[in-house]
């Protein structure tokens, strides 16, 4: 098994690893986040994804996650379990980013636009939160993601 | 028994081109990300470019575009073209499972010289 | 200049525990492997995921991580234990690239 978004195929990433490290940072994450009412992986951004679509949208949220939560949020953890279990959220979100190659084709446009469109929505939502919110919302979101992720798993 | 075995090292004149091979065996060559890492006399490891299953191609700033990563997953090989050599290009070349970023090199060749001087 | 700092020598006493500190921005996000290399010799995995030790390695090799620096332990260092090690990770600039620490020479006295 493999995952395989739309005509991109990610190979050596197996789901139960990434929801292993996940849990083990979980209870952390989503205790600190204090604001219930927000959601940023909302349903508009997840929801009826074509396969087409969906190489687009994980590149983008994927990258968004190592680019600014990844980073961000290292150096405000100091339990060597979580940080242990974000490096391996973080290098297998590297595997499977440094294995997309989503179509630069023109007549992709309207999907890659599309998937774009998407993942503004989760930003925006990022960014109407401050900082620190933002980041531990971001990754006690993890869960929504992977949850996604794991319907592109298959033979 | 996991293997993957260098070739193609040799001497080469400053400003010369050399294409190194590496041919793997004992594991599934096309599931797997690949690296070059190369080691100057009496110096430390220095990873050179890395290719994953696919074909997509990593490089450190360092090299300035002078070298290609590239691999043949029916052959089971592994190449690094590298042109417009330099003599600070002297090193042992080493052929490397894995290596992505932060994934481990989890398997390295026995490494080939290349020497480059007039 | 390395984006992973460790120091170039460290001595060990034959049974005595030796460490070798690897220092990097990007150990934090990343964590950080170590290999082992002896003269004319390719390197070996040692450990990865900044603990977990490789099939075959013994017991008294062990590594941590507190914040940006990983540490390998070796507990009751021995005489076949002398040898270069190299931390690794990922580029600080960017998560594709590979980058190795200057290498640390062990010696056993």
């Known amino acids: 098994q493999e995952f395989h978004f739309g005509p991109c195929q990610v190979k050596g990433v197996v789901p139960q690893k990434l929801w292993e490290a996940f849990w083990a940072v979980k209870d952390t994450m989503q205790a600190q986040d204090n604001i219930t009412s927000a959601r940023l992986l909302q349903q508009e951004v997840l929801q009826n994804v074509s396969d087409a679509e969906s190489c687009y949208l994980v590149h983008t949220l994927l990258e968004f996650y190592l680019k600014t939560v990844f980073k961000n949020y290292h150096n405000r953890t100091v339990e060597v379990r979580t940080l242990k279990s974000f490096s391996t959220l973080a290098n297998n979100f590297v595997l499977i980013v440094s294995q997309l190659q989503p179509s630069q084709e023109n007549e992709m446009f309207s999907i890659r636009d599309s998937a774009h469109r998407r993942f503004l929505l989760f930003r925006r939502a990022f960014k109407q939160l401050d900082v620190e919110a933002a980041l531990t919302k971001a990754l006690g979101e993890v869960d929504i993601l992977l949850t996604w992720m794991q319907k592109f798993y298959k033979l | 028994q996991l293997q993957v075995v260098e070739s193609g090292g040799g001497l080469v004149q400053p400003g010369g081109s050399l294409r190194l091979s590496c041919v793997a065996s004992g594991f599934t060559f096309g599931d797997y990300a690949m690296s070059w890492v190369r080691q100057a006399p009496g110096k430390g490891l220095e990873w050179i470019a890395g290719?994953?299953?696919?074909?997509?191609?990593y490089y450190p700033d360092s090299l300035e575009g002078r070298f290609t990563i590239s691999r043949d997953n029916a052959k089971n090989t592994l190449s690094l073209q590298m042109n417009s050599l330099k003599s600070e290009d002297t090193a042992v070349y080493y052929c490397?499972?894995?290596?992505?970023?932060?994934?481990?090199?989890?398997?390295w060749g026995q490494g080939t010289q290349v020497t480059i001087s007039s | 200049s390395s984006a992973l700092t460790q120091p170039s020598a460290v001595s060990v006493s034959l049974g005595q525990t030796a460490r070798i500190a690897c220092q990097g921005d990007?150990?934090?996000?990343?964590?950080a492997n170590w290999y082992q290399q002896k003269p004319g010799q390719a390197p070996a995995l040692v450990i990865y995921?900044?603990?977990s030790r490789t099939s075959g390695i013994p017991e008294r090799f062990s590594g941590s991580r507190s914040g940006g620096t990983a540490t390998l332990s070796i507990s009751g260092a021995q005489a076949e234990d002398e040898a270069d090690y190299y931390c690794h990770s990922a580029d600080s600039s960017n998560y594709f690239l590979s980058v190795f620490g200057g290498g640390t020479h062990l010696t056993v006295l």
């Open positions: 995921d900044d603990d």
């Open positions: 490397a499972k894995g290596g992505i970023g932060a994934t481990v090199f989890g398997s």
């Open positions: 990007s150990i934090g996000n990343y964590g």
């Open positions: 290719i994953t299953w696919n074909g997509n191609t």
